[in-house]
Interface confidence: low
C-alpha cells in the first residue's frame, strides 16, 4: 500500500480523508491510529462510533476528530491545531472483530516558518508528492499562528 | 509540478525602483516562504531576504535593509520583490526560490533553496 | 554573518575523473548546508540538502559530507553535464550566505 504525505502548517487544522468501497466495508467501524516505527504496531488515536449507524456522529481523542460517510465510503479524519509531535506515520483502518484491514497509509508533515531561538538551524522543505485517490488533505485558511522569527548571525 | 514563473526583464534608470513578481503552482502557496536570490553579472549568488508567504513575516540582508521590500499575494499566489532607488551595482538576474520552512515528520527535518524561478534580470542604466 | 568560503576557485578536470569540491564555514552550521549546481544562463539546481541528502533525481555520483565548518562534494565520476559552477549555502542564521562558487571545467 503506496503512503500518502499530507502537509499541514502549525497551528493549523489537517483534513484527511481515506476512501473505501463503500459494500466491501458494510458494517464496519473505522479507525486512525499512529504507526511505532516503520515495521512497529499502530497505536489506535480514535474509532469511530460504536454504533455503525452513528458512526457519521463526530467522535473525538483530544485534538483528532473521526466521522464515517458509511454510504459514500469516506472517513475523515481532522487533527486540529498541528504541532510538531503530531508529525509521522498513520493508518485509516477498518475494523472486523479484532482484525484492522489498513484502508491508507498517511505520512503527516508539519510545516512552520524558519526557526525559532530554540531550534537554531533547524529548517526544511518538503518534497511535493503527489496527492493520488484515496486520501486528500483541505488546509484550514485561518492565518493568526504567529511564528517567531530565525536568530541572526 | 511545483513552478515559480517570474515576470520579464526590465530596464530601468538610476534612482528607480523595480517589482520583480514571482507566480507559484503546484503547491500550497501559504505553506512556504519564498527566498529572493540575485546574481550580477559574472558574479556569485547573493541572498537578499526571505518572506513567509504564511503570515508576512519578512527577513532582509542587511546591505539592502531600507530599499527592498518583499510582499506576497496570496489570492494569485504570487511574491513580489521591490527595490528602490537603484544604482548600476543592482545590476543583476534576481531570483525567487521556495523556501525555506520547518517541517516536522518522523525522525528528522531539513532545508532546501528548491524550486527555483527562471530569473529576471534587471538592468539599472542611465 | 557566516562566511563560506569554496575552494578551489577553479577545478579542471577531465570527463571520468573525481572532483572534490570544499567549503568552509567561518562558523559551525552543524550539517544546515547546501549545494547547487549552476550553469550559464540557468537558475541554480539544488543537489545536495543537510549537507549529505541527495535531492530528488540527483544521479548517485554525486554525494557530499561533512558537519560543523568543513563540507565536500564529491563526484565521483564527471560526467560532460556536470561542468559547471557548484555553490554551497548555510541554512542556519539569517542571512542564508552562499559561498563564493567552485568552477568546474573541462580540462
Known amino acids: 500500500l503506496n503512503t500518502t504525505v499530507l502537509q499541514g502548517m502549525a497551528g493549523q487544522s489537517l483534513r484527511v480523508s481515506c476512501t473505501y468501497d463503500a459494500l466491501k466495508h458494510w458494517g464496519r467501524r473505522k479507525a486512525w491510529c499512529r504507526q511505532l516505527g516503520e515495521e512497529g504496531p499502530c497505536q489506535r488515536v480514535v474509532s469511530t462510533h460504536g454504533v455503525w449507524l452513528l458512526a457519521f456522529l463526530k467522535k473525538r481523542n483530544g485534538s483528532t476528530v473521526i466521522a464515517d460517510d458509511t454510504l459514500a465510503g469516506t472517513v475523515t479524519i481532522t487533527l486540529k491545531n498541528l504541532q510538531a509531535g503530531d508529525a509521522g506515520l498513520y493508518q485509516c483502518q477498518s475494523l472486523r472483530g479484532r482484525e484492522a484491514e489498513v484502508l491508507q497509509k498517511v505520512l503527516v508533515e508539519v510545516l512552520e516558518d524558519p526557526l525559532d531561538d530554540q531550534d537554531a538551524g533547524d529548517l526544511w522543505v518538503p518534497e511535493e508528492s503527489s496527492s493520488f485517490e484515496g486520501a486528500q488533505v483541505e488546509h484550514s485558511t485561518s492565518r493568526n499562528q504567529e511564528t517567531s522569527f530565525p536568530p541572526t548571525s | 509540478q511545483v513552478q515559480l514563473v517570474q515576470s520579464g526583464a526590465e530596464v530601468k534608470k538610476p534612482g528607480a525602483s523595480v517589482k520583480v513578481s514571482c507566480k507559484a503552482s503546484g503547491y500550497t502557496f501559504t505553506n512556504y516562504g519564498i527566498s529572493w536570490v540575485r546574481q550580477a553579472p559574472g558574479q556569485g549568488l547573493e541572498w537578499m531576504g526571505w518572506i513567509s508567504a504564511y503570515n508576512g513575516n519578512t527577513n532582509y540582508a542587511q546591505k539592502l535593509q531600507g530599499r527592498v521590500t518583499m510582499t506576497t499575494d496570496t489570492s494569485t499566489s504570487t511574491a513580489y520583490m521591490e527595490l528602490r532607488s537603484l544604482r548600476s551595482d543592482d545590476t543583476a538576474v534576481y531570483y525567487c526560490?521556495?523556501?525555506?520552512?520547518?517541517?516536522?515528520?518522523?525522525?528528522?527535518?531539513?532545508?532546501?533553496?528548491?524550486?527555483w524561478g527562471q530569473g529576471t534580470l534587471v538592468t539599472v542604466s542611465s | 554573518e557566516i562566511v563560506l568560503t569554496q575552494s578551489p576557485a577553479t577545478l579542471s578536470l577531465s570527463p571520468g575523473e573525481r572532483a572534490t569540491l570544499s567549503c568552509r564555514a567561518s562558523q559551525s552550521v552543524s550539517s544546515y548546508l547546501a549545494w547547487y549546481q549552476q550553469k550559464p544562463g540557468q537558475a541554480p539546481r539544488l543537489l545536495i540538502y543537510?549537507?549529505?541528502k541527495r535531492a530528488t533525481g540527483i544521479p548517485a555520483r554525486f554525494s557530499g559530507s561533512g558537519s560543523g565548518t568543513d563540507f565536500t562534494l564529491t563526484i565521483s565520476s564527471l560526467e560532460p553535464e556536470d561542468f559547471a559552477v557548484y555553490y554551497c549555502q548555510q541554512v542556519s542564521l539569517f542571512p542564508l550566505t552562499f559561498g563564493g562558487g567552485t568552477k568546474v571545467e573541462i580540462k
Open positions: 543537510d549537507a549529505s
Open positions: 526560490a521556495r523556501g525555506p520552512t520547518k517541517a516536522y515528520y518522523g525522525s528528522g527535518s531539513y532545508v532546501v533553496f528548491d524550486p
